[in-house]
Interface confidence: low
C-alpha cells in the first residue's frame, strides 16, 4: 500500500494586506479515512485555523467542495488578510478514531503579508536655531511588512548623508516600524528650504511615500541693525532711522531709547517678505535738536523672537547744529515732556 502524502506545493506565499490568501494542500490517497485540519505553527501551541467538521471560521473557506466524493484537494482561502495572519500554515491529515489521531503533516506554507508603510511623519527641533548650527529632524513610518525598506532624506532635492536609521523590531515580526534622524546644518538662506523623508517599499510599486518639514519652523535668522541720521530739516528736526534687515521669523519688537529712557516701542506686523523669506523693517524717530542743550544718545533696541535684546546707538551732536534764539531757555523750562520726539 502506497504511503499517504500530504502535499503543500508552495513553500511560501506572499499576500498584500486586505487581499485573500490561497493555501494549497492535496493528499495522495483517500485512505485511511479521516479529516484534514489546518494549523498555524507547529507543536503543542499551534493554532487551529480550519476544521471542516466543527468550529466557526468566518474568514476561511475551502477552495473545492470538501463534501464531494473522492475529494483530495483540501486547499483553503483566507480572506481579508492582515499582518497578524503571517506565519507558517500546516495541512494535517488525521486518522478517524475516538479521538482522531494525527497521521501526517504537510511541509508547511509560510504566509508573509505585504503591508504598506504609514505616511512618513517628519518632526523638527523643539526650538529654533541660527545659521551654522545643526538641527535634527526625525521621520517615522509604521506597520509595514516585509522588513526590507529604503528611507532617504533630501534637502531641497539634494540627498542628505548625516542620517541614522533604525528598523524595529530586529527579529521576525508581523509588521515593522522605521525611525530615522537626519542632521541638517542651517544657513541664512534656509527660510524657504524643505526637508523630505522618502520611504520606498515593495508595496508602494515605485511611488515612494513622502513626509516633509519646512526649515522655516526650525530656523531663526537674527537681524542686522543699522542706525543712521538723515540730513537736518529746515525746522531743526533730525530724522534718525533704525534699519532692521534680514530677520526671520517676523516676531520682533523695536524700542527707541533717548539718553537711556524709553521713547517708543513698536511691534513688527504684516511686513513684506524678501525673496529669501526674511523680513526687513525700518523705524524713524524725529528729534528736535533745538530743544536740547547736550548731545542726544539714541538707542535702537531690538528683541527678536524672544532672544536677548540687541542694541545699536547713535549720538546726535547738538553742538553741531545752530540753535534758535531762546531755545535753551525753553528747553530748561519745558523739562522732558516736550522733546518733540515722534
Amino acid at each position: 500500500e502506497e504511503e499517504l502524502q500530504v502535499i503543500q506545493p508552495e513553500k511560501s506565499v506572499s499576500v498584500a494586506a486586505g487581499d485573500s490568501a490561497t493555501l494549497n494542500c492535496t493528499v495522495s490517497s483517500l485512505i485511511p479515512v479521516g479529516p484534514i485540519q489546518w494549523f498555524r505553527g507547529a507543536g503543542p501551541g499551534r493554532e487551529l485555523i480550519y476544521n471542516l467538521k466543527e468550529g466557526h471560521f468566518p474568514r476561511v473557506t475551502p477552495v473545492s467542495d470538501p463534501t464531494k466524493r473522492n475529494n483530495m484537494d483540501f486547499s483553503i482561502r483566507i480572506s481579508n488578510i492582515t499582518p497578524a495572519d503571517a506565519g507558517t500554515y500546516y495541512c494535517v491529515k488525521f486518522r478517524k478514531g475516538s479521538p482522531d489521531v494525527e497521521l501526517k503533516s504537510g511541509a508547511g506554507t509560510e504566509l508573509s503579508v505585504r503591508a504598506k508603510p504609514s505616511a512618513p511623519v517628519v518632526s523638527g527641533p523643539a526650538v529654533r536655531a541660527t545659521a551654522e548650527h545643526t538641527v535634527s529632524f526625525t521621520c517615522e513610518s509604521h506597520g509595514f511588512s516585509p522588513r526590507d525598506i529604503t528611507l532617504k532624506w533630501f534637502k531641497n532635492g539634494n540627498e542628505l548623508s548625516d542620517v541614522q536609521t533604525n528598523v524595529d523590531p530586529a527579529g521576525k515580526s508581523v509588521s515593522y516600524s522605521i525611525r530615522s534622524t537626519a542632521r541638517v546644518v542651517l544657513t541664512r538662506r534656509d527660510v524657504h528650504s524643505q526637508v523630505i523623508c522618502e520611504v520606498a517599499h515593495v508595496t508602494l510599486q515605485g511611488d515612494p511615500l513622502r513626509g516633509t518639514a519646512n526649515l522655516s519652523e526650525a530656523i531663526r535668522v537674527p537681524p542686522f541693525l543699522e542706525v543712521t541720521q538723515q540730513s537736518m530739516r529746515a525746522d531743526n528736526q533730525v530724522n534718525v532711522t533704525c534699519q532692521v534687515t534680514k530677520f526671520y521669523p517676523q516676531r520682533l519688537q523695536l524700542t527707541w531709547l533717548e539718553n537711556g529712557n524709553v521713547s517708543r516701542t513698536e511691534m513688527a506686523s504684516a511686513l513684506p517678505e524678501n525673496k529669501d523669506g526674511t523680513y526687513n523693517w525700518t523705524s524713524w524717530l524725529l528729534v528736535n535738536v533745538s530743544a536740547h542743550r547736550d548731545d542726544v544718545k539714541l538707542t535702537c533696541q531690538v528683541e527678536h523672537d524672544g532672544q536677548p535684546a540687541v542694541n545699536k546707538s547713535f549720538s546726535v551732536k547738538v553742538s553741531a547744529h545752530p540753535k534758535e534764539q531762546g531755545s535753551n531757555t525753553a528747553a530748561e523750562n519745558t523739562g522732558t515732556n516736550e522733546r518733540n520726539i515722534y
Epitope: S12, S14, S112, P146, D148, T150, K152, F154, G157, E159, E198, A200, H201, V202, L204, Q205, G206, D207, P208
Partner: antibody
C-alpha cells in the same frame, strides 16, 4: 500619476550621435527610482541600454557602454540619452521608463523611433 | 550576463481557456532578502510594454487577478487563468537582479 515622454530627432546619420530626452511629469525625478532607457529594433525584442539615479549614479549595458552616456537634469525634471558612433544596427524604438528600487520597470514612455540612415 | 529563456515563443490560445508561459534564468534570481528579481511585461500590438508582475509574484497596480506569477530561483511561470481577447501581445520576462538587466526573447500570444 507619473508619465514619461521621449523627444529627439527621428533620423540620425551613420557615425553621428543619437540624442534623446525624457521628460518626467506627475512626479519628481529625485524620488527613489532609477530612470531607464530600453530599445527595441523593428520586429525584435527588448534590449536594456542603461539607467541613472538622480544623484548621477549610472549603470550601462556593457555591450553599449563605450558609446552611451545617460545624464539627469533635476531642474528640468528630465533625463537624457546620448549614443555615439551610431550605425544602422542602432535603428530602434527607444523607450524611457522608471524602475523602482523594489519593483519592475514602469511606467514606460510611448517610445520614439530613431532611424540611422544617410 | 544572466541569460533569460522563454518558452514557448508562440502560444495560440482560446478565449476563456488558461495559458501558461515559462521563463528560465541562467542563474538564480533569488536575492538574500527573499525576493525573486523577476518581472513580467506585456507589450500589446503598437503599444509600449506594461508591467504585469514584479518580484516574481506581485501583481502590478491595475493588473487583473487572472494574471499570476510564480516560481523561485531559476524557474518562473506566468499563468493566465482565463484568456481574454485583450490579453494578446508579446509577453517578456526580465531579470532585475544584476546589470545588465536582461529580457527573455518574448512569447507571442494570439487568439486561435
Amino acid at each position: 500619476q507619473v508619465q514619461l515622454q521621449e523627444s529627439g530627432p527621428g533620423l540620425v546619420k551613420p557615425s553621428g550621435t543619437l540624442s534623446l530626452t525624457c521628460a518626467v511629469s506627475g512626479g519628481s525625478i529625485s524620488s527613489s527610482n532609477w530612470w531607464s532607457w530600453v530599445r527595441q529594433p523593428p520586429g525584435k525584442g527588448l534590449e536594456w541600454i542603461g539607467e541613472i539615479y538622480h544623484s548621477g549614479s549610472t549603470n550601462y549595458n556593457p555591450s553599449l557602454k563605450s558609446r552611451v552616456t545617460i545624464s539627469v537634469d533635476k531642474s528640468k525634471n528630465q533625463f537624457s540619452l546620448k549614443l555615439s558612433s551610431v550605425t544602422a544596427a542602432d535603428t530602434a524604438v527607444y523607450y524611457c521608463a522608471r524602475r523602482g528600487i523594489w519593483f519592475g520597470v514602469g511606467p514606460w514612455g510611448q517610445g520614439t523611433l530613431v532611424t540611422v540612415s544617410s | 550576463d544572466i541569460v533569460m529563456t522563454q518558452s514557448p515563443l508562440s502560444l495560440p490560445v482560446t478565449p476563456g481557456e488558461p495559458a501558461s508561459i515559462s521563463c528560465r534564468s541562467s542563474q538564480s534570481l533569488l536575492h538574500g532578502n527573499g525576493f525573486n528579481y523577476l518581472d513580467w511585461y506585456l507589450q500589446k500590438p503598437g503599444q509600449s510594454p506594461q508591467l504585469l508582475i514584479y518580484l516574481g509574484s506581485n501583481r502590478a497596480s491595475g493588473v487583473p487577478d487572472r494574471f499570476t506569477g510564480s516560481g523561485s530561483g531559476t524557474d518562473f511561470t506566468l499563468k493566465i487563468s482565463r484568456v481574454e481577447a485583450e490579453d494578446v501581445g508579446v509577453y517578456y520576462c526580465m531579470q532585475g537582479l544584476q546589470t545588465p538587466r536582461t529580457f527573455g526573447q518574448g512569447t507571442k500570444v494570439e487568439i486561435k
